[in-house]
Interface confidence: medium
């Protein structure tokens, strides 16, 4: 039954990957992994998202051998680097290979780091917001999603993606405006429930 639930989840992920595409899947993965591994750096989460997307693409295309290999490689990487990913992985990483991946996929959220700085400093107040956004849009939005998600394990992934979309729309509009900062200064007010 655990197996049934797991394969139903996998089918749902495949359907989402097919329907919404790789970019949307990566955004979902950034949000979920950031909630699960809030102590991991953005670089680490980005790497896990890239690898996870590859695993799901292969699994969904029916390339079962590649899928199993890459899944095992990802579990191995996570366990070898658990000190910089999450303190909750110890038990999973002691399990045999076949159980390891499933256990990691279901692992509880790690504790949030203490005294995380305000998000506004980097994403609203910084003079480099439009410069950073223009340089690598998806990366900058990914970083926003990571920072927001790791601070809000209580939010649904759907809500986090909606907030990231609002932020993206605001930057698209404001970074072309005469006074970008004035334009996006109140963007976080739109996030209030």
């Amino acid at each position: 039954d655990e197996g049934k639930a797991s394969s139903a989840k996998q089918r749902l992920k495949c359907a989402s990957l097919q329907k919404f595409g790789e970019r949307a899947f990566k955004a979902w993965a950034v949000a979920r992994l950031s909630q699960r591994f809030p102590k991991a750096e953005f670089a680490e989460v980005s790497k896990l998202v890239t690898d996870l997307t590859k695993v799901h693409t292969e699994c969904c295309h029916g390339d079962l051998l590649e899928c199993a290999d890459d899944r095992a490689d990802l579990a191995k990487y996570i366990c070898e680097n658990q000190d910089s990913i999450s303190s909750k992985l110890k038990e999973c990483c002691e399990k045999p290979l076949l159980e390891k991946s499933h256990c990691i996929a279901e692992v509880e959220n790690d504790e949030m780091p203490a005294d995380l700085p305000s998000l506004a400093a980097d994403f609203v107040e910084s003079k480099d917001v439009c410069k950073n956004y223009a340089e690598a849009k998806d990366v900058f939005l990914g970083m926003f999603l990571y920072e927001y998600a790791r601070r809000h394990p209580d939010y649904s992934v759907v809500l986090l993606l909606r907030l990231a979309k609002t932020y993206e729309t605001t930057l698209e509009k404001c970074c072309a405006a005469a006074d970008p900062h004035e334009c996006y200064a109140k963007v976080f007010d739109e996030f209030k429930p």
Epitope: A43, E44, S46, T50, Y77, N132, E135, A136, V139
Partner: nanobody
Framework: EVQLVESGGGLVQAGGSLRLSCTAS????????MGWFRQAPGKEREFVAA?????????DYADSVKGRFTISRDNAKNTVYLQMNGLKPEDTAVYVC?????????????????WGQGTQVTVSS
């Protein structure tokens, strides 16, 4: 924890060239902005060059090295390079590589989390 190991330093005559390399221990290297700093004896550590994360399509240089030094990265090899041409005696220093996942790119040392041990560059006249 990211370990950074620099190599390529040495003794060279004024006008000569050197290529420094900095290799990172992590497969997550792609998500780090990388920078080179230098410290001459009795002087403050100073910014030399930086390259942005991921594609590395944005670079920045200290005015003193613009047009002479070039920073680049090879994500497949987890390595960042500093090609130094037209070296001058005042370029003599220990060159240190640094990594940051806090910003797309930065010239500020306080925004870098990880530092190498450094490699000595000596330019004789």
């Amino acid at each position: 924890e990211v370990q950074l190991v620099e190599s390529g330093g040495g003794l060279v005559q004024a006008g000569g060239s050197l290529r420094l390399s900095c290799t990172a221990s992590r497969r997550a290297f792609i998500g780090y902005a990388m920078g080179w700093f230098r410290q001459a004896p009795g002087k403050e550590r100073e910014f030399v060059a930086a390259i942005s994360w991921f594609a590395g399509d944005t670079t920045d240089y200290a005015d003193s090295v613009k047009g002479r030094f070039t920073i680049s990265r090879d994500n497949a090899k987890n390595t960042v390079y500093l090609q130094m041409n037209g070296l001058k005696p005042e370029d003599t220093a220990v060159y240190v590589c640094a990594a940051s996942s806090a910003r797309p790119m930065s010239g500020r040392s306080d925004e870098y989390h990880y530092w190498g041990q450094g490699t000595q560059v000596t330019v004789s006249s």
